[in-house]
Interface confidence: low
């Protein structure tokens, strides 16, 4: 057969769907690879062909669109499962072609099982809510296109395993779930189950997301350097190890890049010839405020090193701060040797 532009296996789009639920999967060619959409392709006389390779097999085979109740069907650039089965797992290929043009891409589809509490290997999206920030909402995700607007589905929300009803600060409102005042206790997995009728059958869509309550922008402050500070002096003798921790607290800020770095005599450690190592550790509070510690270490400090300026810098979307460490050379203790011989026993 003639050459086909093969985009290979697009592992960036690892699609996961639940067993025994409808799934609609768009051909990724038009989303990410080609500069035209399906309508343009169709009107230009191009045909979209689907086939697949079963899990643990090498053989490409056509998709059976003649299953009872049209369990698998294609509509424009969408492959439909009504519903999925566990053994639908595999690599799916959509190919766009006519006599002179061909382009195809494959993508993995994994059909996963969930237990009665909605636990599954599904990778869950995380939705962050600000703590004590007034009313905030989450929306049942990825349900567009499953039923027409004339159909009114029933939506049931769960936290963990349990139906959300009569909760103090969480109110189901159709496709939305409203948090009146988000608290740490609201952290957890929330599931919406959307039930809708279609051609005399009832289908369920299960969508779970993780809610993480994070620090509010109302409470956000510029970085705070706890160490170095004015109370601690790093006093060393030449030859000893110099260890200076830089510990910085960052308020949680959505999409903020938190940075900590040292300068020695105004230069980054990489730009000078001293044998310096820097080790970083990061810890988070329950509301995702961050504490970063960078320990600057010079194994065998010289008297020259003890005269240098060591400054810890920190930056977030809220601002930039810096603090110098107090470093000095230890003064040797005076040696008291009394010359007792002097003035005694002289004859």
């Amino acid at each position: 057969s003639e050459r086909c532009d093969d985009w290979g296996l697009d592992t960036m789009r690892q699609i996961q769907v639940f067993e025994d639920e409808p799934a609609r999967i768009k051909c990724p060619l038009f989303e990410h690879f080609l500069k035209f959409n399906y309508s343009t392709a169709h009107s230009a006389g191009l045909t979209l062909i689907w086939y697949w390779t079963r899990q643990d097999r090498d053989l490409e085979e056509p998709i059976n669109f003649r299953l009872p109740e049209n369990r698998i069907s294609k509509e424009k650039d969408v492959l439909w499962f009504r519903p999925t089965l566990l053994n639908d797992t595999g690599n799916y290929t959509c190919m766009l072609r006519n006599t002179t043009y061909c382009s195809k891409v494959a993508f993995p589809l994994e059909v996963v099982q969930k237990d009665s509490c909605f636990n599954s290997p599904m990778k869950l999206p995380v939705h962050k809510l600000y703590i004590e920030y007034g009313i905030q909402r989450i929306t049942c995700p990825n349900v567009d296109g499953y039923f027409p607007s004339s159909v009114k589905p029933t939506i049931t929300w769960y936290m963990g395993c349990y139906k959300i009803q009569n909760f103090n600060n969480v109110i189901p409102e159709g496709m939305n779930l409203s948090f009146l005042i988000a608290l740490i206790s609201n952290n957890g997995n929330y599931t919406c189950v959307v039930t809708y009728p279609e051609n005399g059958r009832t289908f369920h869509l299960t969508r779970t997301l993780t809610v993480k309550v994070v620090g509010s922008p109302k409470n956000a402050v510029p970085p705070v350097i706890h160490s170095p500070n004015d109370h601690v002096v790093y006093e060393k003798e030449p030859g000893e190890e110099l260890l200076i921790p830089c510990t910085v607290y960052f308020s949680f800020l959505m999409d903020s890049r938190n940075e900590v770095w040292w300068t020695i005599d105004g230069k980054k450690p990489d730009d000078i010839t001293i044998d310096v190592t820097i080790n970083e550790s990061i810890s988070h509070s329950r509301t995702e405020d961050e504490t970063r510690t960078q320990i600057l270490s010079i194994k065998k400090v010289t008297s020259e090193d003890l005269k240098r300026s060591y400054v810890c810098h920190a930056r977030s979307a809220k601002g930039e701060v810096a603090k110098a460490a107090k470093v000095k050379q230890k003064v040797p203790a005076p040696r008291y040797t009394v010359e007792l011989a002097c003035g005694f026993g002289a004859t």
């Epitope: 067993e19 025994d20 099982q113 969930k114 237990d115 009665s116 509490c117 049931t156 349990y162 139906k163 009569n166 909760f167 103090n168 189950v193 039930t195 009832t202 369920h204």
Partner: antibody, heavy 120, light 107 residues
Framework: EVQVVESGGGLVQPGGSLRLSCAAS????????MSWVRQAPGKGLEWVAN????????HYVDSVKGRFTISRDNAKTSLYLQMSSLRAEDTAVYYC?????FGSGYFDYWGQGTLVTVSS | DIQMTQSPSTLSASVGDRVIITCRAS??????LAWYQQKPGKAPKLLIY???NLESGVPSRFSGSGSGTEFTLTISSLQPDDFAAYYC?????????FGQGTKLEIK
């Protein structure tokens, strides 16, 4: 050894009230959802209500909503069912049951039951 | 709420027989199903949870299968101690609901 023991059953007139208790031992009571399940004479099982570990969530079967209240005292490792506006159809053996691991919804330990008879 | 339909309601069998009890949910409950055994005057006893997981201490002649809406409890070789009532229970969505029960009696 896990044990749940119900008490408080008896004969009550229609419209009356009764409070059932369940004493739990042999497990960390505060870590488990707890439920009441009932069984009318010669009939099948019916789940009545359950309560979250800290008491912050309670769920009821529709037929008892507004009449029954489930509660717990973790310090006393006890579960309660306050029943009011009782009807003849509430006559049953009431079982206290522990739900499996967090929120699982199946019942791995049951008490022997306490009989509630609603009759005039 | 979800309805659970158990069949048969009564089952006559002999020691050594293979027995199958079925339970159908009015809508998909994934694998959120448990099976219980109950003897007269006694509390129910958990046999199977999550459709097919055998509760510890339950003889291996009991097994469960199914997912979605159709479930079965199988007793591979009936023993004298197995004559009792059996109930399925869903715990997937909404309130927990039990099947109406199957009475297993000696033929």
């Amino acid at each position: 050894e896990v044990q749940v023991v119900e008490s408080g059953g008896g004969l009550v007139q229609p419209g009356g009230s009764l409070r059932l208790s369940c004493a739990a031992s042999g497990f960390t009571f505060r870590s488990y959802w707890m439920s009441w399940v009932r069984q009318a004479p010669g009939k099948g099982l019916e789940w009545v209500a359950n309560i979250k570990q800290d008491g912050s969530e309670r769920h009821y079967v529709d037929s008892v909503k507004g009449r029954f209240t489930i509660s717990r005292d973790n310090a006393k490792t006890s579960l309660y069912l306050q029943m009011s506006s009782l009807r003849a159809e509430d006559t049953a053996v009431y079982y206290c049951a522990r739900e499996g691991y967090f929120g699982s919804g199946y019942f791995d330990y049951w008490g022997q039951g306490t009989l509630v008879t609603v009759s005039s | 709420d979800i309805q659970m339909t158990q069949s048969p309601s009564t089952l006559s069998a002999s020691v050594g027989d293979r027995v199958i009890i079925t339970c159908r949910a009015s809508q998909s409950i994934s694998r959120g199903l448990a099976w219980y055994q109950q003897k007269p005057g006694k509390a129910p006893k958990l046999l199977i949870y999550k459709a097919s997981n055998l509760e510890s201490g339950v003889p291996s002649r009991f097994s469960g299968s199914g997912s979605g809406t159709e479930f079965t409890l199988t007793i591979s070789s009936l023993q004298p101690d197995d004559f009792a009532a059996y109930y399925c229970q869903q715990y997937s969505y909404y309130s927990h609901t039990f099947g109406q029960g199957t009475k297993l009696e000696i033929k």
